[in-house]
């Protein structure tokens, strides 16, 4: 806390300029009017204030706006944003995407800080949903942003936002998150034809159920092995050898290299060895000929 002292004669700040960097902390406190600071916030960023001086400026703004800063001030915080605590940010009402971009720019190149996480949360809640422009902006700064959201939060993503999602944005998503995003992607891309549709939906297929994989197998999509390996095991298991062959097309040969890894390993265990042999890949571990296969999942459903 800076002591309240009178401003020395002739030092009263008429505007926010470089001369202020020579002011001691107590002089800044005494000689800079908070209202002047608020109206000239855009200048602060261009002046090389020390961290201690920035603390004083923040303190002045806190006194002027105890209920939270107005957006006109927030938009021009610049490096002063790094001085804000999550508690400070929770008082804000940020509605402009330009304000969000300006503040994210300050933190660019760093991990998502608690301040940034709070800012994004306030912004998205204020908008009511994660619209396309916001998602575009957030994933540009933080490619893993989408996968940092809970399934409940992802539910508020409108399908039009899915168009902004790049494959790398989904790299760290777990199956529960893809379970929510995949149906939205299906809705978003529903007006596309077969091959275009597959290109767009491919990154989301980790959330696809068996029926959808069966439908895709009829579309000559030639899924690559990297995509196949990311499919849900429970969605792959019911697929027949013929369906997997159609789904993968020429990439089916890659199954041999992956036969010890899930979901391929588990899928092999569910197939008749006779059927696996038709692929001519030397896949082993299927159900021997003459054995009876009981589908226990169907039995459970009936009981």
């Amino acid at each position: 806390e800076v002591e309240k002292t009178a401003c020395p004669s002739g030092k009263k700040a008429r505007e926010i300029d470089e001369s202020l960097i020579f002011y001691k902390k107590w002089e800044l406190e005494a000689c800079v009017d908070a209202a002047l600071l608020a109206t000239q916030m855009d200048r602060v960023n261009a002046i090389p204030f020390t961290y201690e001086q920035l603390d004083v400026l923040k303190h002045k703004l806190d006194e002027l706006y105890p209920q939270g800063y107005p957006e006109s001030v927030i938009q021009h915080l610049g490096y002063l944003f790094l001085k804000m605590s999550p508690e400070d940010i929770r008082k804000w009402n940020v509605t402009s995407l330009e304000t969000l971009k300006a503040l994210l720019e300050v933190n660019k190149g760093h991990e998502m800080s608690p301040q940034v996480a709070t800012l994004i949360d306030r912004f998205v809640k204020g908008r009511g949903q994660l619209d396309k422009d916001t998602l575009d902006t957030l994933t540009a700064f933080y490619p893993g942003y989408l996968c940092s959201l809970s399934p409940e939060e992802l539910s508020s993503v409108p399908p039009s936002s899915i168009w902004a999602v790049r494959p790398q944005d989904l790299d760290t998503c777990d199956p529960r998150q893809l379970d929510v995003l995949y149906p939205k992607a299906r809705l978003a891309f529903q007006n596309m034809n077969g091959s275009e549709y597959f290109v767009k939906i491919q990154s989301f297929l980790g959330g696809a159920p068996t029926e959808d994989l069966k439908a895709l197998s009829q579309q000559n999509v030639s899924m690559d092995l990297a995509t196949f390996m990311k499919l849900r095991t429970d969605a792959v298991l019911p697929l027949t050898v013929a369906e997997v062959q159609k789904l993968l097309g020429p990439h089916v040969e890659g199954l041999k290299a992956e036969e010890r890894h899930r979901p391929v390993r588990d899928w092999i265990l569910r197939q008749r060895q006779d059927d696996l042999d038709t692929l001519g890949l030397g896949l082993q571990g299927g159900i021997p000929n003459g054995y009876l296969v009981l589908d226990l999942s169907m039995q459970e459903a009936l009981s």
Epitope: P151, D179, R186, N191, E211
Partner: antibody
Amino acid sequence: EVQLVQSGAEVKKPGASVKVSCKASGDTFKRYYAHWVRQAPGQGLEWMGIINPSGVSTTYAQKFQGRVTMTRDTSTSTVYMELSSLRSEDTAVYYCAESRLPGYNAFAMDVWGQGTLVTVSS
Amino acid sequence: SYELTQPPSVSVSPGQTASITCSGDMLGYQYGSWYQQKPGQSPVLVIYQDNRRPSGIPERFSGSNSGNTATLTISGTQAMDEADYYCQAWDGDAFVFGTGTKVTVL
């Protein structure tokens, strides 16, 4: 034959909530995308939202965002639509409908419930 | 928000052809569906994906969609076709229904 059977008519006071159910009979092994659509007296059809087959993903019309919740009980093949903060303008017949058509991009509503009349009146 | 506009009413004589239009911005880039609704009944899907008929729907119902207009055509209209008809499309975030057209068979 595939059928969607909805819960009975409801009368609610303004500010209250209503929860309408829709149970699938017939081909219950397979699950489908389920929509909710409403129709005010003498008016047209209005789409409210959709829930995916497993019940984990919902998409709501902007107008109902924050006021509607769609859920699914897969064990009983039942979907639910709850609408809160009811007002007189919410008086309507509420329909559930499913997309059972073949194809990865067919979301048209080919199976409909009989409708549930919800009256909001003080 | 996205709007689909239909004529309020269309009249047709039995055996004649009825055409109902549905106009919306860039509608030709979306798949269009059509629903029939008779008084006191739930809607029935008659056309989906522009021109496909669900099983059980008579061949006299057909559909097309290009530019900004989707069209439902009922050839050889019968008295039982008298109903309200709604078009429907996806606007990117929601399914949108048209304003509805009352078809009267004279």
